[in-house]
């Protein structure tokens, strides 16, 4: 129980895509402000988004320090203009978030087909290796750098004249598929982490078709 004019945050929700991670909560503040704290299970609490009237807090900088750790956040409520005020128990009112393990739970962002090249009856399709906000030695790591072979891509490909989608899979960012000579094909890719039980798939990439500028055709 806090002071009469503050309410505890609720519906604390992690929103995370390719490790860009934001904690959201309710309600919109009326005469109150919020501060967020985050910690690993064994670590110390670190305060973020001090005395904010927002109902979200970007915690990316904290979670990218170790994406395999499990994090817990909490949102404190303070009366606006009187942030030293505490609840009746001598503590500000706060609510805990669910636990969050970025490596296991971050959503996979929509992939992009970088290019495709046809050589005779083979097509090489390359998926863009998206940069994340995870750093190592002052360098931003790509999605492939972070997930390694845990990340696979499924390619859906089909003749422009047909509806049936064939599939191919790779644990790199490249596909080499067989196609029929003289046929135009369309492509879409999906990122998947098969070892996960939730948040396993990305949305599909935009469809790219042969005869458009992304591709290159060489008759051999």
């Amino acid at each position: 129980s806090g002071t009469t004019n503050t309410v505890a945050a609720y519906n604390l929700t992690w929103k995370s895509t390719n490790f860009k991670t934001i904690l959201e909560w309710e309600p919109k503040p009326v005469n109150q402000v919020y501060t967020v704290q985050i910690s690993t299970k064994s670590g110390d609490w670190k305060s973020k988004c001090f005395y904010t009237t927002d109902t979200e807090c970007d915690l990316t900088d904290e979670i990218v320090k170790d994406v395999k750790q499990t994090y817990l956040a909490r949102v404190f409520s303070y009366p606006a203009g009187n942030v030293e005020s505490t609840g009746s128990a001598g503590e500000p009112l706060y609510e805990n978030s669910p636990e969050f393990t970025p490596y296991l739970e971050t959503n996979l962002g929509q992939p992009t087909i970088q290019s495709f090249e046809q050589v005779g009856t083979k097509v090489n399709v390359t998926v863009e290796d998206e940069r994340t906000l995870v750093r190592r030695n002052n360098t931003f790591l790509s999605l492939r750098d972070v997930f390694g072979k845990d990340l696979i891509y499924t390619l859906y490909y089909w003749k422009s004249s047909s509806s049936g989608k064939k599939t191919a899979k790779t644990n790199t960012n490249e596909f080499l598929i067989d196609v029929d000579k003289g046929e135009n094909y369309c492509f879409s890719v999906q990122a998947v982490i098969p070892s996960r039980t939730v948040n396993r798939k990305s949305t599909d990439s935009p469809v790219e078709c042969m005869g458009q500028e992304k591709g290159e055709f060489r008759e051999i």
Partner: antibody, heavy 120, light 107 residues
């Protein structure tokens, strides 16, 4: 516990139709690919087709193309196999199976199967 | 479509025997081959995936290997519960295709 349960099999006349259901529990079909595989009496396994419930993409074996349609209802966590213009050679036990979309693309869980008999 | 030619179609063996079943792919399928066990009236069960990885809960007497387009399932010491039909399957490309099956019978 992951489970797939097929239903809807039975006796149907040549040229008739039947809809099979594959009800999933213990996982959400949206996150996987669902395949249908059949096995004629005393014969081997024959792949029928797949659906990716996250985007509705499908592909069918030549032997059923134009006659069979696979669909999915993610709110019911169920995949379907609509079989039209049935022939005697479609008589088989029909299984649905889950594909975790790994590079090896194994089918890691199968239903118990439902028997479809096409006969006059 | 890729053909998976499985041999032998049947074999007789005794408990404790080492059993080898082979599948040959008609073209390169990388390691995208799985092996299944099926008993009469039951659904197939996954044994081996990605050519050589033992699926969770499968006894270690089962193993898989690859040499080019040839794939092998080995049962190091046949147990009474291993008498069944075994199928290989490729899913390197659509459509996925199965071998014709190998029935392992009691000698």
């Amino acid at each position: 516990e992951v489970q797939l349960v097929e239903s809807g099999g039975g006796l149907v006349q040549p040229g008739g139709s039947l809809r099979l259901s594959c009800a999933a529990s213990g996982f959400t079909i949206f996150d996987y690919i669902i395949h249908w595989v059949r096995q004629a009496p005393g014969k081997g396994l024959e792949w029928v087709g797949y659906i990716d419930p996250s985007n509705g993409y499908t592909y069918y074996a030549d032997s059923v193309k134009g006659r069979f349609t696979i669909s999915a209802d993610t709110s019911k966590n169920t995949a379907y196999l609509q079989m039209n213009s049935l022939r005697a050679e479609d008589t088989a036990v029909y299984y649905c199976a889950r594909d975790p979309q790994s590079v090896g693309s194994e089918f890691d869980y199968w239903g118990q199967g439902t028997l479809v008999t096409v006969s006059s | 479509d890729i053909q998976m030619t499985q041999s032998p179609s049947s074999l007789s063996a005794s408990v404790g025997d080492r059993v080898t079943i082979t599948c040959r792919a008609s073209q390169d399928v990388n390691t995208a081959v799985a092996w299944y066990q099926q008993k009469p009236g039951k659904a197939p069960k996954l044994l081996i995936y990605s050519a050589s990885f033992l699926y969770s809960g499968v006894p270690s007497r089962f193993s898989g290997s690859r040499s080019g387009t040839d794939f092998t399932l080995t049962i190091s010491s046949l147990q009474p519960e291993d008498f069944a039909t075994y199928y290989c399957q490729q899913h390197y490309t659509t459509p996925p295709t199965f071998g014709q099956g190998t029935k392992v019978e009691i000698k």
